[in-house]
Interface confidence: medium
Amino acid sequence: AAIIPQSSACPNTEAKDFLQNVKVNLKVFNSLGAKVSSRRPSDYLNRSTSPWTLHRNEDPDRYPSVIWEAQCRHQRCVNAEGKLDHHMNSVLIQQEILVLKREPESCPFTFRVEKMLVGVGCTCVASIVRQAA
Amino acid sequence: AAIIPQSSACPNTEAKDFLQNVKVNLKVFNSLGAKVSSRRPSDYLNRSTSPWTLHRNEDPDRYPSVIWEAQCRHQRCVNAEGKLDHHMNSVLIQQEILVLKREPESCPFTFRVEKMLVGVGCTCVASIVRQAA
């Protein structure tokens, strides 16, 4: 990804100023209303054939300050008998997310936007068997 | 929801002003560098026992403008023989993400931050059997 100077459709907006002076209105937040905020944590992490644990990633200078990162519990998947199936692998599903990071010692508060790659949960896939040539 | 400083080291920062006048520096973007942007889409969506499809959600007035939303292909999971297993359910793993939406006709450019709930992939869970009382 790259950010490079250019002219702007807004008159008198210099690229160098623009980059550091984008205003963000943080008042309006949920595009899906209560559907987002009220949702309960799911129990899929325990019930899945590729169960996972959630690890707390906390940074008080970031929004969201707490991000829960998934890690698969096993390398293999759990079969109907509760045993590990050596033909099936638990793999991490990852998602790229945006976060706001507070610039150190900035007054007034200034944030930068960052991308993070986070594990969201695990799924079960058939092992790929490599055939000898 | 709003982002409000918990204890403000900056004097005279009123929350009401703060919310609408947060500056965001767009110069620094990838916290993980090339690890994020260059990563290839995974083939897990086809190889999973709970396969999914990706649907394109496109909005040129949003960043990211293209978001891929997962939907489980089947209500059940696929077993080793490639048949649907009626004791196992495919369920959607969802993640809350932040997006930037451009405020209409704003000069200089002003953005609002929104939360979206997106499907990231699917996992396979044992069906919950409800016992009769």
Epitope: A1, A2, I3, I4, P5, Q6, S8, A9, A15, F18, L19, V22 | L26, F29, S37, E58, P60, D61, R62, Y63, P64, S65, V66, L100, K101, R102, F109, F111
Partner: nanobody, 119 residues
Framework: EVQLVESGGGLVQPGGSLRLSCAAS????????MYWVRQAPGKGLEWVAS????????YYVDSVKGRFTISRDNAKKSLFLQMNSLRAEDTAVYYC????????????WGQGTLVTVSS
């Protein structure tokens, strides 16, 4: 998957002309501002030109104004850069890039096409 494929680069003498093309796929081409950017040997990325979604407005870096013309064909999902009166300092790899609402930010650009201006 978003794809941008540039073509049309090559070796040209000072004062000569080239026309670069970019074929886009994987997104709604007509909904996005598009850009040409370049990277000279040993230098950083430099924005060259941009064009609005409907082609109504174009913007150029000062050093190419009057010499380069950006255009687009939304029906064919194509972006073009007509380069006239080329100079040695225009030597660079030229990339086509898809714009985002963040006007200075690119998530996607092509593999680039090399333009060499030399006698």
């Amino acid at each position: 998957e978003v794809q941008l494929v540039e073509s049309g680069g090559g070796l040209v003498q000072p004062g000569g002309s080239l026309r670069l093309s970019c074929a886009a796929s994987g997104f709604t081409f007509s909904s996005y501002r598009m850009y040409w950017v370049r990277q000279a040997p040993g230098k950083g990325l430099e924005w060259v030109a941009s064009i609005e979604q409907d082609g109504s407005e174009e913007y150029y870096v000062d050093s190419v104004k009057g010499r380069f013309t950006i255009s687009r064909d939304n029906a064919k999902k194509s972006l073009f850069l007509q380069m006239n009166s080329l100079r040695a300092e225009d030597t660079a790899v030229y990339y086509c890039a898809k714009g985002e609402i963040l006007p200075l930010y690119f998530d996607y650009w092509g593999q680039g096409t090399l333009v060499t201006v030399s006698s």
